[in-house]
Amino acid sequence: ECVIKLFSDIYFQGGDITTVYTPNAKHCQVVCTYHPRCLLFTFMAESSVDSTKWFSCILKDSVTESLPKVNMTGAISGYSFKQCPHQLSACNKDIYVDLDMQGMNYNGSVTKNAQECQERCTNDAHCHFFTYATRQFPSAEHRNICLLKYTQTGAPTGIRKLKKVVSGFSLKSCALSNLACIRDIFPSTVFADNNIDSVVAPDALVCRRICTHHPNCLFFTFFSQEWPKESHRNLCLLKTSESGLPSTRIHKNQALSGFSLQNCRHSIPVFCHSSFYYDTDFLGEELDIVDVKGHEACQKMCTSAIRCQFFTYSSSQESHNKGKGTCYLKLSSNGSPTKILHGRGGISGYTLRLCKMDNVCTTK
Amino acid sequence: ECVIKLFSDIYFQGGDITTVYTPNAKHCQVVCTYHPRCLLFTFMAESSVDSTKWFSCILKDSVTESLPKVNMTGAISGYSFKQCPHQLSACNKDIYVDLDMQGMNYNGSVTKNAQECQERCTNDAHCHFFTYATRQFPSAEHRNICLLKYTQTGAPTGIRKLKKVVSGFSLKSCALSNLACIRDIFPSTVFADNNIDSVVAPDALVCRRICTHHPNCLFFTFFSQEWPKESHRNLCLLKTSESGLPSTRIHKNQALSGFSLQNCRHSIPVFCHSSFYYDTDFLGEELDIVDVKGHEACQKMCTSAIRCQFFTYSSSQESHNKGKGTCYLKLSSNGSPTKILHGRGGISGYTLRLCKMDNVCTTK
């Protein structure tokens, strides 16, 4: 059930996944929605007692989809929009006054105003958010300075009150970046730059979508199921470099490489993976096993089960079971299978719940 | 492969599950062995640079069963004995000189010596470990005081150097307790006392074994698969009370209750669950899917796969597949299934790897 309202002075007890920092409860709710496992959250507002906890956004999960509510001054709690039918966007154009969002300050320069600073951030490959010191800032040498910032998670490592500064986020997710959008996928190619993370994926398109929605992934390399080393098959390496482009291209069969689509305006979904993968089993943490008629019904079942992230449908019992096969509903810590097996006859795929999280934009 | 040796001045990088405190590396290795997921560990000895990290035992896991080794003064690393064939015991009779093992001090009294203090701990239902101030202790009013201690995990919350004290563990796991050993399982009974934890189990016997090896479980209630509320079926509630006995017995059909066997001398295994559960599917995190001939072969496969904790064997494809069925190897955070389904035709069970962790004792 979709619960949009926020609960003031209420803390959800237990179920903690991780803590991030957000400028307000509304943004915390969006972060929770995009997190692969978060179903509920508690945000600690400035009115809360412990100032070291201000702006902390505690992401939570629960098998029962609910947690005990405890009274706590300054806590604001709510549910993710995963349970809701409406279209979503990670785009956040808000400017936060008197807040310093903390991260790695990797670029500082003078800009006319906060809007220009935000544009700089949007057009810099590494920038997640910025802080701008206004012309009223006490220290004269810092006035009009635009600090571009990034972190390993894409979210601030902390947020503090600071007079006469404003902060905001990159508008890449609003499809407002002027950076190059490279849609090509390069066969027989390995990019040998820095790996940020690795996930398991059924094909290069899914690998690209995962890269697109990873805060620091600029390009990727995917090892196909035919890759000679078994341990690397279906492995998607998420990559970055200082320049923002791959420094090293190596020719290797059965590998494919490409770029994040974070700078693109999309006519196709880049968040949800709607294809079916035949003769493919996705392994993960099992949520439930149910009998359904066909793999489409299995995908529907997964989409309607709020904690389900992907599924495998096995038709081996169809003949004995009134045309029904077995639908395995699954999840993992990052939303991707922990392993992919081929040749076992399963049909696998992902929840379509994420489709509503795509930006609705025109092609760039 | 079984690696018994410890690596001095080596730190295993990454893979952290949790940190506990142990008096030495040898005890850390035993804790790792009994932890459901730990395969490797790093112990920080007194020779390490950061004194706040002394005696910390960092339990680690790795999909590849290994982690990068990094040079670090005072770190001692090694592997769990899960990979080893020899019989094991959690019994630890060692006395640690000049160490204060920290926990909740819930009982302090005068004893003649450390041995008598250890006996008191062994014969107190709640005691996990003790610290004894010797007759040379600087503060006269604390001399010969025996502090009985417990913690939520059964392990110290910290360990510090303290002159003229000695510390040690309860010898309940050495089968040396004089506390009552109640083997009865009470049908149609719910104990409504404090819940420490809840796990999923296929029957009351497995629930009892889990209770027996939980540091704080004194008794349990198990809801059978016939329990009217679906959400509670196969739920094993691990319980405690201040007195050590249930305060509240409520008559309810389809529930069974009983006591931890931690005070018993066992003629039967109480750690490993060797039965097969027919027409039963255990759900969990999937490790692998393999084709094998029969459920015994599946159990063997699980036992030999070091990270496998339980399995489900499905014979539905036997007819098409040269008499082979599908063996699903699984794990979870606590070693128990996350859910149990009935009526789907699977045959499920647990790894036999834990059988070597049982005390070999005579019947009491």
Epitope: Q13 | V190, N195, K229, E230, L237, K239, I250
Partner: nanobody
Framework: QVQLVESGGGSVQAGGSLRLSCTAS????????MAWYRQAPGNECELVST???????YYADSVKGRFTISQDNSKNTMYLQMNSLRAEDTAVYYC????????????????????WGQGTLVTVSS
């Protein structure tokens, strides 16, 4: 979203009476085991009384003969009639559904399928 809402708490003199109510939404009483728990400041959560789905009742020794548990399935409401109240009955009283024992001595932690209300304060002055 299952919700249990308690009402009827308040202040009363020793020897007085109060009637607590617990109303459930998104939840039916007839196949549930309902209970009242209480937690006094600094104390652990304790079971006061239970009414099982088959109509069986249980009372803690400290309240036997003074408290009566009942439920009205048509109103999806459970009651606790508290007579001859004593100072030691002062606590926050929690309504619980399918909750066999509290967790870590706290009247809010649940295992899957168990539910708690948010509590209502009862103060008895001597």
């Amino acid at each position: 979203q299952v919700q249990l809402v308690e009402s009827g708490g308040g202040s009363v003199q020793a020897g007085g009476s109060l009637r607590l109510s617990c109303t459930a939404s998104e939840f039916t009483f007839d196949d549930s085991d309902m209970a009242w728990y209480r937690q006094a400041p600094g104390n652990e959560c304790e079971l006061v009384s239970t009414i099982t789905s088959d109509g069986g009742t249980y009372y803690a020794d400290s309240v036997k003969g003074r408290f009566t548990i009942s439920q009205d399935n048509s109103k999806n409401t459970m009651y606790l009639q508290m007579n001859s109240l004593r100072a030691e009955d002062t606590a926050v009283y929690y309504c619980a559904a399918d909750q066999w024992g509290s967790a870590e001595g706290d009247c809010t932690s649940s295992y899957p399928g168990g539910y708690w209300g948010q509590g209502t304060l009862v103060t008895v002055s001597s």
